[in-house]
Interface confidence: low
């Protein structure tokens, strides 16, 4: 018989249930915008804001200065204050819209959807390792702010995102706002614009360049902005909007939009779709041809890559990358494939398209009837034309205006579809060592931190836990202070370490050895801890090996049994050989020993299941006793692995040392031509692995075995004549004395 | 930047023991293990030992066990390693080198080295 | 312990020509063999671990393969500053061990 040891899932290796509980801080509302402070004198802050007030916290996420930023109108409201007496506007709530740092002084500025989208800047006071918040100062000038042309007027209640950019020691706002009717009428916020904050912080600098939809455009044709960052000599907005201004706007598509970081000018706004797909690795039928589109982004961020990101990007090591997460619609809810996709775009191969989108439109020949595009901010035009005009004039260049890349950046989804069913809802990307880690938060309140890498079958987990009990969104907005990430959900502020909450999860010494380096995860005995948790027995050197089942359960106290013993730790190599004196497996008082492995046994295990198998010949001692007894397997002066060596011992109940009795064998007699169908009565016949019945010698071919009986048929007998028939157990003999006697056929 | 400082170079007399020194900066030193190695003049590498610069276990090439002692000073990030009963057999430049334990037991990061000369 | 032979002991090379060392172990140790540059009076340097595996800030002309008993490093344009000695070194088993070296050497 051919016994195989089962496969254990890979996820067997893990409990992604374990409790993890990561500091946290209680905002007293849902949380609108957060934002995090490192000073050069070791001074840090975390600023969290929530409808009508701003928190202030330091490093551990304990408050340090609240500060009430509405309704407007009411007199407690400290930001509204520093505009001097009102009234400025319709009173309401302040939702923080906006909440940046600006490095030059360094300073907070935040802006609200009350006092017309005004910002209001906070200087930064370290105290300590802490940082307070000086008065506000109010970045409005009502003599040059009109319904009409405000520069001031910053946020939209729709949404804002914003970059701040240090152009020699000015400090420009690169401010991407969501539109309708209703709020462009309303003190006309733009739709992207770049606004130069005065020395004197009284506002922003009027005459700001600027783009707008269209008037006609406004009801049919919104813009979401998803995020913004600033890499090189670019900053990048991210939209989800309609794929046309024409056609149906619920059809939507994500696009990048670039602006010069070095040149506070539109002219060369630039913006290329971004296709994000899931192509799986078999094809269904009926699937889209490239893959399932996921066009609608829903969290973004950039970062530098590590080594092995990079090499399967085809790139550099530390090259900027931009992720993002993709999903099939507005709603989220795929029909088939994964809810959740990221798409991985390295910012030089996204300038390069872009560039040459920008040599397409403009040197000759132009291919006819090539749209410059972007119809809802400008006039239709073809290139090489400007936005409105016929022709090209003589003074006038076709790289200085506005232009949509007529070929967009299509990738596959780096996960292969292996999110499944989560939704991801934030999303923060760190370098660890040569690791590239996306950390994610979800819609249920978990957060997944995952090694990307785009050639598995499975995901490579840091860590998967919930981060409270409450199970609400994550939300988009992560922020980095030191070695820890901040996440958003409900009212509440966690801070997770960007190594992992720790080593819990990870259930088997050897999964957990394997940990990345920078998690500090060791073994403390019988689980995976940081040396913090368990100073005493905490190592990070070896493993013993786990048996987990061993085959058969029982063997005859005389003769041998083959014993295979499955688990983990065996070898650490995959070639399961075993240096010699290495393993020494004990059942009871006796020896088993080791067996060479059978390479032509030797099966490809899937990396998602894990299994080792060990095999060794056991003999009884004499003075084993009969009965129930345990099988140890101890590993010593195993070489070293890549992550550890095998080192300890592991023991198992369960294995029974029986003694086979022949009770009753009939028939006695049968035809010389053999064939007769022997029976065999006993006890403990199926002991052990190996049992041959011998009728003069000669093997009588077992066609059953259980444990009370033995079926075989007899061979054919030289003559006729009575002969000895015995039964072997393990190559040894059972008592009794028997025969058969072959008569005439 | 990870850098390895060793101490200066060091004439002694043979029959005596000597403790050199290893100062780690510009990385997480409990998150790492220090190797040391043997180069005499004009020969290959020798791979003396390792110390865990978290919990001071140590691995020592047989070759060495009586002759290289190693330690670790958490508070100071530095690790030694001291050398008994020197002979002129131990003439050699030392080298102490950063192993990271999770891209296995390559020396990723060596200390510029100590030249010990053993002299009556 | 574990013997590596390096081959051949100098290498005479003029620039731009592709070079190879060879590094052969006593036994199996699968790709636990790490390659190291050595110039006059410096500290070793990491140049290839895992047999082939690259290492960030190592010039890309630097290769590796090989597995089991046999291996290899290449640099395919050798560049006057690459004189210096190379050495293997495996940590397949205790105690560690380095190769002999093989010394690089303009013609």
């Known amino acids: 018989e051919d016994w195989q040891c089962p496969r254990t899932p890979y996820a067997a290796s893990r409990d992604f249930d374990v409790k993890y509980v990561v500091p946290s801080f209680s905002a007293g509302g849902l949380v609108q915008a957060m934002v995090t402070y490192e000073g050069d004198r070791n001074e840090s802050a975390v600023f969290v804001a929530i409808r009508n007030r701003l928190h202030v916290l330091g490093p551990d996420l304990k408050s340090v200065q609240s500060l009430a930023t509405g309704p407007a109108g009411d007199p407690g409201c400290q930001t509204c204050a520093a505009c001097g007496p009102g009234p400025h506007g319709p009173p309401g709530d302040t939702d923080t819209k906006v909440l940046v740092l600006d490095p030059a002084l360094p300073a907070l500025v935040s802006c609200g959807s009350s006092l017309q989208g005004r910002c209001f800047l906070h200087d930064l006071e370290p105290q300590g390792t802490a940082v307070h918040l000086a008065a506000p100062a109010c970045l409005f000038s009502a003599h040059h702010n009109r319904p009409d042309d405000c520069p001031d007027c910053v946020a939209s209640p729709l949404g804002t995102r914003v970059t701040v950019v240090e152009q020699g020691q000015a400090s420009y706002f690169y401010v991407a706002s969501s539109l309708d009717a209703a709020v462009a009428a309303s003190f006309s916020p733009r739709s992207v614009s770049i606004r130069r904050l005065k020395a004197d912080a009284s506002g922003f600098a009027p005459g700001f360049v600027a783009l707008s939809v269209l008037p006609k455009h406004l009801v049919s044709y919104s813009i979401e902005y998803v995020h913004s960052f600033h890499t090189g000599a670019f900053v990048y907005f991210l939209t989800v909007q309609p794929a046309s201004v024409t056609d149906d706007p619920s059809a939507l598509h994500t696009r990048l939009a670039r602006l010069s970081a070095t040149e506070p000018e539109l002219g060369d706004y630039r913006e290329l779709v971004l296709d994000c797909r899931f192509a799986p690795k078999r094809r269904r039928r009926g699937a889209p041809e490239g893959g399932q589109p996921y066009p609608v982004l829903r969290v973004a961020h950039s970062a530098p890559v590590g080594a092995q990101l990079a090499t399967e990007l085809s790139i550099a090591e530390g090259q900027e990358v931009l992720f993002g997460v993709f999903v099939t619609g507005k709603d989220g809810g795929p029909g088939v494939g994964p809810n959740s996709v990221v798409c991985a775009f390295p910012i030089d191969l996204l300038d390069t398209l872009i560039d040459e989108g920008v040599e397409r439109c403009c040197e000759s020949p132009v291919h006819p009837g090539l749209r410059r595009g972007l119809d809802f901010f400008q006039s239709p035009s073809f290139c090489p034309n400007p936005p409105g005009l016929e022709a090209l004039s003589p003074n006038t260049s076709c790289r200085h205006f506005p232009l949509l890349v007529s070929s967009s950046f299509s990738r596959v989804d780096l996960f292969n579809g292996l999110l499944g069913p989560v939704q991801v809802t934030a999303l923060y990307v760190t370098r660890l060592d040569n690791v590239t880690v996306a950390h994610m938060g979800t819609m249920d309140g978990r957060i997944l931190q995952v090694e990307l890498v785009r050639s598995l079958n499975y995901l490579l987990y840091v860590s998967n836990f919930s981060l409270g009990d409450s199970g609400q969104p994550v939300q988009r907005d992560v922020s980095r202070l030191g070695d820890h990430l901040l996440f958003a959900s409900g009212d509440q502020v966690f801070q997770v370490p960007i190594q992992g909450p720790g080593c819990r999860h990870f259930l088997t010494c050897g999964r957990c050895l394997r940990a990345w380096h920078f998690m500090g995860c060791g073994w403390c005995g019988n689980m995976c801890g940081q040396q913090k948790e368990c100073p005493g027995s905490w190592q990070q050197d070896h493993c013993p090996p786990k048996l987990t089942e061993f085959h058969p359960h029982s063997g005859p106290l005389r003769g041998s049994t083959r014993l295979t013993l499955c688990g983990s730790n065996f070898y650490l190599h995959p070639s399961g050989l075993v240096p010699e004196g290495t393993h020494q497996v004990t059942v009871g008082q006796s020896p088993c020993r080791p067996l060479p492995k059978d390479s032509s046994k030797l099966r490809p295990v899937p990396r998602k299941d894990f299994v080792e198998e060990f095999e060794c010949e056991l003999e009884p001692l004499g003075t084993q006793a009969v009965g129930p007894t345990n099988v140890s397997l101890t590993v010593t002066n195993m070489p070293p692995g890549k992550h550890f060596r095998v080192d300890g011992t592991s023991v198992l109940r369960g294995f029974s040392f029986m003694e086979p009795v022949l009770i009753a064998v009939q028939p006695l007699f049968g035809p010389r031509a053999g064939g007769t169908c022997l029976t065999l009565e006993g006890q403990s016949l199926s002991v052990g692995t190996s049992r041959a019945v011998l009728v003069n010698g000669t093997e009588c071919l077992l066609a059953r075995v259980s444990e009370g009986q033995l079926l075989c048929a007899t061979p054919p007998g030289a003559t006729v004549a009575s002969v000895p028939l015995s039964l072997q157990v393990g190559g040894a003999q059972v008592p009794g004395s028997w025969t058969f006697q072959y008569r005439e056929d | 930047e990870v850098q390895l400082q060793q101490s200066g170079p060091e004439l002694v007399k043979p029959g005596a023991s000597m403790k050199i020194s290893c100062r780690a900066a510009g990385f997480s030193f409990t998150g790492y293990t220090m190797n040391w190695v043997k180069q005499s003049h004009g020969k290959s590498l020798e791979w003396i030992g390792l110390i865990n610069l978290n919990n001071g276990g140590t691995s020592h090439n047989q070759k060495f066990k009586g002759k290289a002692t190693l330690t670790v000073d958490k508070s100071s990030s530095t690790a030694y390693m001291e050398l008994l009963s020197l002979t002129s057999e131990d003439s050699a430049v030392y080298y102490c080198?950063?192993?990271?334990?999770?891209?296995?037991?390559?020396?990723?990061?060596w200390g510029q080295g100590i030249s010990v000369t053993v002299s009556s | 312990d574990i013997l590596l032979t390096q081959s051949p002991a100098i290498l005479s090379v003029s620039p731009g020509e592709r070079v190879s060392f060879s590094c052969r172990a006593s036994?199996?140790?699968?790709?636990?063999i790490h390659w190291y540059q050595q110039r006059t009076n410096g500290s070793p340097r990491l140049l290839i671990k895992?047999?082939?595996e690259s290492i960030s800030g190592i010039p890309s002309r630097f290769s590796g393969s090989g597995s089991g008993t046999d291996f290899t490093l290449s640099i395919n344009s050798v560049e006057s500053e690459d004189i210096a000695d190379y050495y293997c070194q495996q940590s397949d088993s205790w105690p560690l061990t380095f190769g002999a070296g093989t010394k690089l050497e303009l013609k």
């Open positions: 080198a950063r192993w990271l334990r999770r891209g296995g037991y390559a020396m990723d990061y």
């Open positions: 895992y047999a082939s």
């Open positions: 036994q199996n140790i699968g790709t636990s």
